[in-house]
């Protein structure tokens, strides 16, 4: 099939980085500046992506591949191919419509992105809290209360309810 197609369509012989130039009897011409073609047989080259504003160039556009962008410091990538940049927050915070907000009591976020998540409920696994949770860190569960030596005690807080207004946006 490939051989048949190339006999019928000279454009199929044009490699990536070129286009099939109709103005020149379908000769394969190199893509012009600021453009690329990632596959063979293309009749036009695609315009290179420009990493502007909050986007930063990770790799410039070549003749066969589009430019790759990431985000400037203080932002992180979202979406396929870093199609969006979202503001970073501090650990112990989450991004809402009103900006970065501290995690409510009983929730934590150990990253600069994403939402605050509830602390692990140790009692669901029959365990006790060994280290209390913070806004930045989950609780650390320890042995079950029955395994503790006499006189030792632990506190297992109730599973928190998320406060209204702090849900992920």
């Amino acid at each position: 099939f490939e051989r048949t197609r190339s006999l019928q369509d000279p454009c199929s012989n044009c490699p990536a980085g070129t286009f099939c130039d109709n103005n020149r009897n379908q000769i394969c011409s190199p893509c012009p500046p600021n453009s690329f073609s990632s596959a063979g047989g293309q009749r036009t080259c695609d315009i290179c992506r420009q990493c502007k504003g909050v986007f930063r160039t990770r790799k410039e556009c070549s003749s066969t591949s589009n430019a790759e962008c990431d985000c400037t410091p203080g932002f992180h990538c979202l979406g396929a191919g870093c199609s969006m940049c979202e503001q970073d927050c501090k650990q112990g915070q989450e991004l809402t419509k009103k900006g970065c907000k501290d995690c409510c009591f009983g929730t934590f976020n150990d990253q600069k992105r994403g939402i605050c998540r509830p602390w692990t409920n140790c009692s669901l696994d029959g365990k006790s809290v060994l280290v209390n949770g913070t806004k930045e860190r989950d609780v650390v569960c320890g042995p079950s209360p029955a395994d503790l030596s006499p006189g030792a005690s632990s506190v297992t807080p109730p599973a928190p309810a998320r406060e209204p207004g702090h849900s992920p946006q």
Partner: antibody
């Protein structure tokens, strides 16, 4: 495949204007958005980019030369030209014309022409 | 403006591997092209887009690019490879073409 050929006087007097023309064959100079460039090489030295022009007539020049240089297009003749004024002996060099394609790649090049500045 | 730095000379025995470097600030994000220029001739493209070869260039020629250094490697060097080699980028910030100073490859 495009071919490029430089032409112009091989000898220029100091303080005069150096004028070179590049003739493009095998393709149209005003199609596809290519950039058309001049590059020079002083005897025994490295390559020095002079500037380029593209089909809209917009041009970019090496900052060290931009006060003295002008590149122009003549699409009717499929040519582009270099004018470098107020030349001195330091402008003696081989001058190349070339095409710039995707990612700034320079391909093809002309064969080059030696221009000597001397009285 | 953007600056590319190349060592003035590299020497290698026939059959050995020659490596020529091209230094530039964060050059790894840029696209690097390499040209070979033999005495009295126009430059010829030998590697483009960091590591691609034009048709007709032997696979002994290869390129790499990361961090602050791009490298042109010629394996199984032959006497005919003796030439000057130039790296080149397009500085998108200024829209200027930038050449390195060139490296003279001597085959011992």
């Amino acid at each position: 495949q495009e071919q490029l050929q430089e032409s112009g006087p091989g000898l220029v007097k100091p303080s005069q204007t150096l004028s070179l023309t590049c003739t493009v064959s095998g393709g149209s100079i005003n199609s596809q958005g290519y950039y058309w460039s001049w590059i020079r090489q002083h005897p025994g030295k490295g390559l020095e980019w002079i500037g380029y022009i593209y089909d809209s007539g917009s041009a970019y020049y090496n900052p060290s030369l931009e006060r003295r240089v002008a590149i122009s297009l003549d699409t009717s003749k499929n040519q582009f030209s270099l004018n470098l004024n107020s030349v001195t002996v330091a402008d003696t060099a081989v001058y190349y014309c070339a095409r710039i394609v995707a990612a700034g790649r320079i391909d093809p090049w002309g064969q080059g022409t030696l221009v000597t500045v001397s009285s | 403006s953007y600056v590319l730095t190349q060592p003035p000379s590299v020497s290698v025995a026939p059959g050995q591997t020659a490596r020529m470097t091209c230094g530039g600030d964060n050059i790894g994000i840029k696209i690097v092209h390499w040209y070979q220029q033999k005495a009295g001739q126009a430059p010829v493209l030998v590697v483009y887009d960091d590591n691609d070869r034009p048709s007709g260039i032997p696979d002994r020629f290869s390129g790499s690019n990361s961090g602050n250094t791009a490298t042109l490697t010629i394996s199984r060097v032959a006497a005919g490879d003796e030439a000057d080699y130039y790296c080149q980028v397009w500085d998108r910030r200024s829209d200027h073409v930038v050449f390195g100073g060139g490296t003279k490859l001597t085959v011992l």
